[in-house]
Interface confidence: low
């Protein structure tokens, strides 16, 4: 299944972002690489990578099936990386499958990418 890529994804709650039409000339936001799809087995560990860059440094949010991903101690976590953000899910369960989306904003622009865990 192909990775879905959108700069104005429907999954971004409209009230979450107030995007200025007057962009600062020095600011930019780029999706460097589409998110990877993952096929794995129960009990294994999966990682999804959101590769973005920008100025000012972007803030990245994770969604699963349109809901904010909430970290679960010792099982589900996300953290900043030099390339953006990494979402890791340990001890995979059938309920972990779905569409995972990262949404990055620098306060003026938004980019997003969606990957599938199945």
């Amino acid at each position: 299944q192909e990775t879905e890529l959108s700069v104005s994804a429907e999954l971004v709650p409209t009230s979450s972002w107030n995007i200025s039409s007057e962009l600062n000339k020095d600011s930019y936001l780029t999706l460097d690489e589409p998110m990877n799809n993952i096929t794995t087995s129960l009990g294994q560990t999966a990682e999804l990578h959101c590769k973005v860059s920008g100025n000012p440094p972007p803030t990245i949010r994770w969604f699963k099936n349109d809901a904010p991903v909430v970290q679960e101690p010792r099982r589900l976590s996300f953290r900043s990386t030099i390339y953006g953000s990494r979402l890791r899910i340990r001890n995979l369960d059938t309920t972990d499958t779905g569409y995972f989306q990262c949404v990055a904003t620098n306060g003026k622009e938004v980019v997003s990418s969606t990957g599938v865990l199945f």
């Epitope: 709650p13 904010p68 909430v70 970290q71």
Partner: antibody, heavy 114, light 107 residues
């Protein structure tokens, strides 16, 4: 436009159950989580849990484990929250709220009194 | 569970005042924080997402700052319609937890 319309006020006796409905319009119910939040009179907000109407998955605040049930009827774009074994301290306004807490229902007052 | 505390619990201010409300988390929540405004008898309304991002339709006099454990909501010039109770919410870990609220009333 997006709207969440909740059922009317309820008065229940201790030990009974209450089921509150939340009808969604203006968006697709099945692709947005629905949170339930309650607020006791004069008190703060308390997250109860969510349901993902697309598949019926739920996540609850452990405080309510075993007492709360969240369901949905996608044919009428409605989510439900049922709270059982009611106590007087369950008297509160119960709200539904969409995925990112961007839209809320008007609230349903549930009064538990003998 | 992550505990959220807010200060002050209440404050009195005048129209035009600069108002600052703080929210503190018992552990690092990154910037997984939402600020809400609630008026009596009404549902909460989201103001700020992800600690610093203004929600659509919210006046620019509202701003959010902070990350980790310490967060601030600032109203740069208080307007009559801003008298209300303000809550923070962390969505870093389950269960999601709200702060106890800060009531802003007229001096």
């Amino acid at each position: 436009q997006v709207q969440l319309v909740q059922s009317g006020a309820e008065v229940k006796k201790p030990g009974a159950s209450v089921k509150v409905s939340c009808k969604a319009s203006g968006y697709t119910l099945t692709t947005n989580y629905m949170h339930w939040v309650r607020q006791a009179p004069g008190q703060g907000l308390e997250w109860m849990g969510w349901i993902y109407p697309g598949n019926g998955n739920t996540k609850f605040n452990h405080k309510f484990d075993g007492r709360v049930t969240m369901t949905r009827d996608t044919s009428i774009s409605t989510a439900y929250m049922e709270l059982s074994r009611l106590r007087s301290d369950d008297t509160a306004v119960y709200y539904c709220a969409r995925s990112d807490f961007d839209y809320w229902g008007q609230g349903t007052l549930v009064t538990v009194s003998s | 569970d992550i505990q959220m505390t807010q200060s002050p619990s209440s404050l009195s201010a005048s129209v035009g005042d600069r108002v600052t409300i703080t929210c503190q988390a018992s552990q690092d929540i990154g910037n997984n924080l939402i600020w809400f405004q609630q008026k009596p008898g009404k549902a909460p309304k989201s103001l700020i997402y992800f600690a610093t991002s203004l929600a659509n339709g919210v006046p620019s006099r509202f701003s959010g700052s902070g990350s980790g454990t310490d967060f601030t909501l600032t109203i740069s010039s208080l307007q009559p319609e801003d008298f209300a109770t303000y809550y923070c919410l962390q969505y870093r870990e389950y269960p999601l937890t709200f702060g106890p609220g800060t009531k802003v009333d007229i001096k």
